[in-house]
């Protein structure tokens, strides 16, 4: 399977909410021995590989923000901790998963990564991730609502697998 990032850049005004999205593509095994672990974290554009560094999103680590379920099941993060930080990650039945960030500030600007790990009995993990940039703007040049920029076809199927 692959992870697609429909948008590579989100430009938002301060105070707005934004939902960053990734999509799981390709055949997804829905067998009883398959589990998917999905999460989000901040990162930097490494010289060798993007998304290698894992930094918290608003003080919540990738462990705090994870979703863990089988096949294309729907799931949400634990509400209390995430929502206190204005965050919620979610996953639907169609392979889409997202993180919503409320009341954006300039400090939220940066590179965000989604990670999907397929966990199977007697098989090595299969890891894929996607990356996208969030720019939060203030002042007269800021847009009135979030503006999203589609990924190029090459970027949108940003495959990084072990």
């Amino acid at each position: 399977f692959k992870v697609a990032t429909p948008y590579s850049l989100y430009v938002c005004p301060e105070g707005q909410n934004v939902t960053l999205t990734c999509r799981l593509l390709g055949p997804v095994d829905k067998g009883h021995d398959v589990t998917f672990y999905k999460t989000w974290y901040r990162s930097s554009r490494g010289e060798v590989q993007t998304c290698s560094e894992r930094r918290p999103i608003r003080n919540l680590t990738f462990q705090d923000l994870h979703l863990h379920h089988g096949g294309h099941q729907a799931a949400n993060t634990s509400h209390d901790l995430a929502q206190r930080h204005g965050l919620e990650s979610a996953s639907d039945h169609h392979g889409n998963f997202s993180i919503t960030m409320r009341n954006l500030t300039l400090l939220d600007s940066g590179l965000y990564c989604c990670l999907v790990v397929e966990i199977r009995h007697h098989h090595s993990e299969h890891r894929v991730h996607g990356a996208m940039e969030l720019q939060v703007q203030t002042g007269k040049d800021a847009p009135s609502n979030c503006v999203v920029y589609p990924s190029s076809s090459q970027d949108s199927e940003n495959i990084t697998a072990a």
Partner: antibody, heavy 118, light 107 residues
């Protein structure tokens, strides 16, 4: 905070079996691998294998197949390592560690010393 | 299995010195390498992940570098409390494997 509490030292006879425990607190136990690592006296770290408590999935190092068995009880947030047909070669410190999927061994237990002697 | 080789079993250094420990993988492991510190009588602790990133709370005198098959762990200014064994580990494919360890001795 995240902690792994391991059971106490064991003195065992050759041929016996031992089951050591690793109790997890401070995180969602079902959503991270529990790793098991052996360290014989004066030696380095050897990976025995891992269990994912949420699904029961396991991965064993070939070297330890038939020797080690992993189980996990999500109701008590405890993982277990059972070692069978013990010999003096099994005398070692056994560590459990947490590994979030797609990542590294970020938190380790204090270790359980197993001594096999007649 | 991927073999991780730490060429030096022992390294002797003085407080304030810069010291580098190397680790070589038997095949390309991208940047999927961690470094652990094990002080006498203690369990290992994660210092560096993904070859070059410091884990939470790790002092900035500890750094890592490398990709592919060759990796280096550096302490820029050794402190007395850095007396320990340092292990590299690959996280590219199971079975996860560790280097044999390098014992840092303080003169």
């Amino acid at each position: 905070q995240v902690q792994l509490q391991q059971s106490g030292a064991e003195l065992m006879k050759p041929g016996a079996s031992v089951k050591i425990s690793c109790k997890a607190t401070g995180y969602t136990f079902s959503s991270s691998w529990v790793e098991w690592v052996r360290q014989r006296p004066g030696h380095g770290l050897e990976w025995i294998g891992e269990i994912f408590p949420g699904s029961g999935s396991t991965h064993y190092n070939e070297k330890f197949k038939g020797k080690a068995t992993f189980t996990a009880d999500t109701s008590s947030n405890t993982a277990y390592l059972q070692l069978s047909s013990l010999t003096s070669d099994d005398s070692a410190v056994y560590y459990c560690a947490r590994r979030p999927p797609g990542w590294f061994f970020d938190v380790w237990g204090a270790g359980t010393t197993v001594t096999v002697s007649s | 299995d991927i073999v991780m080789t730490q060429s030096h079993k022992f390294m002797s250094t003085s407080v304030g010195d810069r010291v580098s420990i190397t680790c070589k993988a038997s095949q390309d492991v991208s940047t999927d390498v961690a470094w652990y510190q094990q002080k006498p009588g203690q369990s290992p602790k994660l210092l560096i992940y993904s070859a070059s990133y410091r884990y939470t709370g790790v002092p900035d005198r500890f750094t890592g570098s490398g990709s592919g098959t060759d990796f280096t762990f550096t302490i820029s200014s050794v402190q007395a409390e850095d007396l320990a064994v340092y292990y590299c580990q690959q996280h590219y494919s199971t079975p996860w494997t560790f280097g044999g360890g390098t014992k840092l001795e303080i003169k």
